[in-house]
């Protein structure tokens, strides 16, 4: 079973051994009783370490009490704090206690003094040029409106890429997506289209006002 | 404001080799159409070499003279270069980076140049 | 091909009008794939008409472009001190690959 000993019944530093019955707690200089939990140090002694501020405890029989600053606890302020027990840093960042201060090292999609800014979060986020935020997996994306593209539709999209003009068409980036102009000999939106000698296309029925080798939209 | 500046120009000797670099600010190539060189010898008309697509297709257009000694590349979204070989005297000139936009179904429309770079060819 | 401009120079007093006339060895694309452009000494030519005929943004309505395949006219009327420049046709062809060709250039005296 446990032993009277253990979790360290002794406060203000006392070190515990057991004894056939119980145990015992052998007190630092300055404290009593059976668990050292009797001070009979005053502030006069200066037991407030790490730049503690002693409070009270002005004649010898009253106690004092330890003000510690940030970082330190303890009735003497003699244990650092271990801050990021407390595990402050949210969203899966690291804690690093810098002893003056506290920081977090965010992981990839959050910021924030605390990681709490999750930055693939549509709620928080806006898609440029009509694009709309689509959630999932943990994570988000823009869908673009036509025309646009990256991670927040700012960029223009390149719809040449793909050279969608053929035979010889060239291909321009323009505000309606992109056009074609037809060399001569062809025509339809991509120069998809031969059109015939006496004039005639091979299309089933050639737009209205379509001239040869027109640049199509 | 949309603008083009040439740099790279300067002195060469016959035979030797030139790179010139057009940078556009307030415009990205991809948005634009087509990148295209133009020259002009001192005194002379003017001269078109060669046109680059802003896109990613890199599709290229040259002039028949140019074609061999003359290479347009584009180096990023906002820079395209012209590599020149193989230099004479006469192709000592004012080399200007020139902007080609689609308007009302005709293309090569130079809408928006460069000041210019000199390029002196001379031993 | 070739793009011939005629005559230079030309000049004309200020408030007259003058015809820089720009003719192609051979059609251009879609018969009207024409420019004009104006260019000042040290500076880089600007485009004045597309499309044969149609104004560039900025420019004013004393320029005037008209013409069809492979005859093309610039007219300049109520001219300008300003409007003293060398003028320049561009016309745009396909023949197994895309090209363009600038005239020979036209310098406008104004007086």
């Known amino acids: 079973g446990p032993g009277p000993c253990d979790g360290n019944p002794c406060a203000n530093g006392g070190s515990c051994s057991e004894t056939p019955r119980s145990f015992e707690c052998t007190c630092p200089r300055g404290f009593y009783g059976l668990r050292c939990e009797v001070s009979g140090v005053t502030c006069a002694d200066g037991p407030c370490f790490n730049g503690g501020l002693c409070v009270g405890g002005a004649d010898p029989d009253s106690a004092y009490i330890c003000h510690c600053p940030p970082g330190f606890q303890g009735s003497n302020c003699e244990k650092r704090v271990d801050r990021c027990s407390l595990q402050p840093c949210r969203n899966g960042g690291l804690c690093l206690d810098l002893g003056h201060a506290l920081r977090c090292r965010c992981r990839a999609g959050f910021a924030g003094p605390r990681c709490e800014h999750d930055l693939d979060d549509c709620a928080g986020r806006a898609c440029a040029n009509g694009g709309t935020c689509v959630e999932g997996g943990g994570a988000h994306r823009c869908s673009c409106a036509l025309g646009f593209g990256g991670r927040d539709c700012r960029e223009r999209a390149d719809p040449c890429a793909a050279r969608p003009c053929a035979h010889g068409g060239r291909c321009y980036a323009h505000f309606s997506g992109l056009v074609c102009a037809c060399a001569p000999g062809y025509m339809g939106a991509r120069c998809e289209f031969p059109v015939h000698p006496d004039g005639a296309s091979a299309l089933p029925a050639a737009p209205p006002g379509l001239r040869p080798g027109d640049p199509q939209r | 404001q949309e603008q083009l500046v040439e740099s790279g120009g300067g002195l060469v000797q016959p035979e030797g080799s030139l790179t010139l670099t057009c940078t556009a600010s307030g415009f990205s190539f991809s948005s634009s159409g087509y990148m295209c060189w133009v020259r002009q010898a001192p005194g002379k008309g003017l001269e078109w070499i060669a046109c680059?697509?802003?896109?990613?297709?890199?599709?290229t257009d040259y002039a028949n003279w140019a074609k061999g000694r003359f290479s347009i590349s584009k180096t990023s979204s906002t820079t395209v270069t012209l590599q020149m070989t193989s230099l004479t005297v006469a192709d000592t000139a004012t080399y200007f980076c020139?902007?080609?936009?689609?308007?009302?179904?005709?293309?090569?429309?130079?809408?928006?140049w460069g000041p210019g770079t000199l390029v002196t060819v001379s031993s | 091909q070739v793009l011939t401009q005629t005559p230079s120079p030309v000049s004309a007093a200020v408030g007259g009008t003058v015809t820089i006339s720009c003719q192609a060895s051979q059609s251009v694309y879609n018969n009207n794939n024409l420019a004009w452009y104006q260019q000042k000494p040290g500076q880089p030519p600007k485009l004045l008409i597309y499309a044969a005929s149609s104004l560039a943004s900025g420019v004013p309505s004393r320029f005037k472009g008209s013409g069809a395949g492979t005859q093309f006219t610039l007219t300049i009327s109520d001219l300008e001190c300003d409007d003293a420049a060398t003028y320049y046709c561009q016309g745009t062809y396909y023949s197994s690959g895309w090209y363009s060709t600038f005239g020979g250039g036209t310098e406008v005296v104004v007086k």
């Open positions: 020139a902007r080609d936009v689609y308007i009302d179904s005709t293309i090569f429309n130079f809408n928006l």
């Open positions: 680059i697509s802003g896109g990613s297709s890199g599709d």
